[in-house]
Interface confidence: low
């Protein structure tokens, strides 16, 4: 059977807010007083297993105790009302639960909205934490009928049970309930047609047009409930191969509509496409993107010529020379389609042209010692670009003019030139360069630059620690002007090895020392200067720096017969490396000296 | 109970970077999304970013887009927002606000609240 308690706690399940005083009190029974020879004032009152302090305790009558709270903040504590009972043994009376929270706050920011297919989901910000169980109830009706309510399981959201009725306004708020106290938001009033988040578009599909390459025809089904709903759309479009993504003008897409021609676009490029709707009043919610879709325009001819420049060969005859035609491959943003062949056409003066098709980039011919002009067309299968004209003087007629103050210069791992123009009107630039090296040849990349350009970088694939011969010659409609050259590296670093040093005289007290420059390939860099380190055995060493453009020095005040080491270091501007340890020694006489 | 504590603010250029870091106590971290929010000198809460609970989606208000940078570590209990490039207009007290759920769907837009103290962002020259 179940044990009688010895009395009881009031109130029986406290709930405080939080930061306010509290008070509990605890009533003994009569037959409990009785039993264990004790009153009021044998109550101990425990929170969570420790005493409270006897400031905090008041005896009110022989069965009676209370205790008192200020500024409650814990958000759970078990207090438990205790006697003393025969002196000493502590026995329980009674314990309770005291929570501590804060009244709901009022609901704020009350939103809705009807995901196409499912129910009306509603969200709210239910504001500070209340540190109890609290129900929020969304509540809803129309002017003339209420609909079921909503328990929230969260707290901050609940979908209705009912299917939402369209074109009728409909009257939402949500009721906050806990121990501490009940409130209500604002109820918000909204016809559900103006929260519907419509399915994505569906089906999108790209079509070209051959007549058009800069133009991409979209289509595509709405959903909208079903046709009920009218819809705009919002069209994004990327390259393949970009990742943010372009958006066509809103308003070029605010009336309902399933299909769209998107204009502007480059030819030849596949695009890819992604399109969202909403109610065309925009009220609502855009739904999720559809999925993507992609298209490629089609061709136009190329928009403009390949970079195009020559090179004469050694002839073995007098008469002839043979030249190879050299053009680059346009790039895709420029070929606007498939490059099929390139048209080159040779003219001589007061002569019939000759026209070459070719599917490379280069065309060797052997031509007279006379002027000719060579045009290069690039060409796919909708038509051709405008041509590149290139002069190709005679080889007895001496280029004049060329570039000033030529200069190259490293920068954000770029090799940089730039020049002044030559006071001649200028067709375009030629920029050659290639690596030097005593164990290869010398091969030749280049790039060609617009008559405007008087700066540009290198735009090939550069190695570091590596002597580049750059050479700029500018064109003119008469052929090539002068070339000038110059040296420059990417990124330098001190030298692969150092100088091989040598004696090529040696005296009593002096000594003159040769070597040889380090090997181009074994410099990876400009050589600014070098240090010659020596001394004997027993003496401290001692250095002397010498300029870059010397290969020998004298060693003068030297000691007569002694063992001298020397050693040379040759640096650029990254640093320098040693060369291997050389020795000679000096004789103990000068020459026709006698002891 | 929950509790949020923000830091990682402070005075810097324009163009500058921070990182400002949220602790997460009282709850368990890994199975709710999160925001950051912030607001400026006179002016309401602004929602600036969030992440779903495993951190494989994030989203951000257009006016930090690219320049923000959303992440968690759900051993550490921790959330990080990476600020790139910013301008006086970021100037803001940033907090951080733990959602109801484990996913953040960016159609719905609700009031935000700073349960922390915040950590204050000042932009200037």
């Known amino acids: 059977q179940l044990l009688e308690p010895c009395g009881y706690i009031y109130p029986e399940f406290p709930v405080v807010q939080r930061g306010s005083n509290f008070t509990a009190i605890c009533v003994l029974k009569e037959a409990c007083l009785q039993h264990y020879y004790v009153n009021a004032s044998y109550i101990v009152w425990k929170t969570n297993h420790a005493a409270v302090p006897r400031e905090q305790v008041t005896v009110i009558n022989r069965t009676t105790s209370s205790v008192t709270f200020t500024d409650v903040v814990l958000p759970s504590v078990q207090l438990t009302c205790n006697i003393l009972s025969f002196g000493q043994i502590e026995q329980n009376v009674y314990g309770v639960t005291m929570l501590s929270g804060f009244p709901p706050d009022k609901p704020t920011n009350l939103t809705c909205i009807v995901n196409e297919g499912k129910n009306m989901l509603c969200q709210w910000d239910p504001g500070r934490e209340t540190y109890l169980e609290t129900n929020y109830t969304l509540k809803s009706e129309w002017a003339t009928e209420k609909f079921p309510d909503c328990q929230s399981k969260h707290g901050t959201s609940c979908m209705v049970s009912y299917m939402p009725t369209y074109y009728v306004n409909i009257e939402v708020w949500v009721e906050a309930e806990n121990a501490l106290g009940k409130v209500s938001s604002e109820s918000i009033n909204f016809d559900p047609v103006d929260k519907v988040k419509p399915t994505p578009p569906y089906n999108l599909s790209v079509t070209n047009s051959e007549e058009l390459s800069s133009i991409l025809k979209l289509s595509w089904v709405s959903s909208g409930l079903g046709g009920l709903l009218d819809l705009k759309s919002d069209i994004q479009y990327r390259t393949k191969d970009a990742s943010t993504w372009i958006q066509v003008p809103l308003e070029d897409t605010m009336s309902p509509r399933t299909s769209f021609t998107v204009q502007d676009l480059k030819p030849f490029t596949e695009y890819v496409f992604r399109i969202r709707s909403i109610k065309d009043s925009g009220k609502g919610y855009w739904s999720d993107w559809s999925e993507e879709a992609s298209g490629t325009t089609y061709e136009d001819r190329p928009s403009r010529p390949p970079s195009f420049w020559y090179k004469t060969n050694p002839s073995h005859g007098q008469e002839y020379r043979s030249v190879r035609l050299i053009w680059k491959a346009l790039p895709l943003s420029e070929a606007n389609g498939k490059i099929l062949d390139y048209e080159v056409i040779l003219t001589q003066s007061k002569s019939v042209s000759q026209t070459y098709t070719v599917t490379g980039t280069e065309l060797t011919v052997n031509l007279t010692n006379d002027r000719y002009v060579a045009s290069l067309a690039a060409r796919n299968k909708v038509g051709k670009s405008a041509a590149a004209v290139l002069t190709i003087p005679s080889p007895h007629v001496t280029a004049a003019y060329s570039v000033v103050n030529l200069k190259a210069f490293p920068k954000d791992n770029l090799l940089w030139v730039e020049w002044t123009p030559p006071p001649k009107p200028v067709s375009k630039y030629i920029l050659e360069w290639c690596v030097l090296s005593e164990n290869a040849p010398c091969v030749e990349d280049w790039q060609q630059e617009d008559a405007t350009v008087n700066r540009t970088h290198l735009r090939g694939r550069l190695l570091e620690s590596k002597c580049y011969q750059i050479t700029v010659t500018p064109v003119f409609a008469t052929g090539p002007g002068g070339s000038e050259s110059l040296k420059a590296y990417l990124k330098q670093a001190a030298p692969a090895r150092g100088p091989t040093v040598r004696t090529k005289k040696v005296g009593k007290n002096e000594a003159v020392l040769a070597w040889d420059q380090i090997p181009v390939d074994d410099q990876n860099g400009f050589i600014r200067n070098y240090s010659i380190s020596y001394r004997t055995s027993v003496g401290k060493e001692m250095v002397v720096h010498v300029d870059s453009s010397h290969t020998e020095y004298t060693l003068s005040s030297l000691s007569s017969d002694t063992l001298y080491m020397v050693r040379m270091a040759a640096y650029t501007d990254e640093g320098g490396k040693d060369g291997p340890e050389f020795t000679f020694t000096t004789p103990k006489f000068a020459q026709g000296e006698i002891e | 109970q929950v509790q949020l504590q923000e830091s990682g603010g402070g005075l810097v250029q324009p163009g500058g970077s921070l990182r400002l870091s949220c602790a997460a106590s009282g709850f368990t971290f890994s199975s709710y999304a999160m925001s950051w929010v912030r607001q400026a000198p006179g002016k309401g809460l602004e929602w600036v970013s969030a992440?779903?609970?495993?951190?494989?989606?994030?989203y951000y208000a257009d006016s930090v887009k690219g320049r923000f940078t959303i992440s968690r570590d759900n051993a550490k209990n921790t959330l990080y927002l990476q600020l790139n490039s910013l301008k006086t207009e970021d100037t803001a007290m940033y907090c951080c606000a733990k959602h109801v759920t484990g996913d953040y769907d960016p159609s719905l837009r609700y009031g935000y609240n700073c349960w922390g103290p915040g950590t204050q962002v000042t932009v200037s020259s």
């Open positions: 992440i779903n609970s495993g951190g494989g989606s994030t």
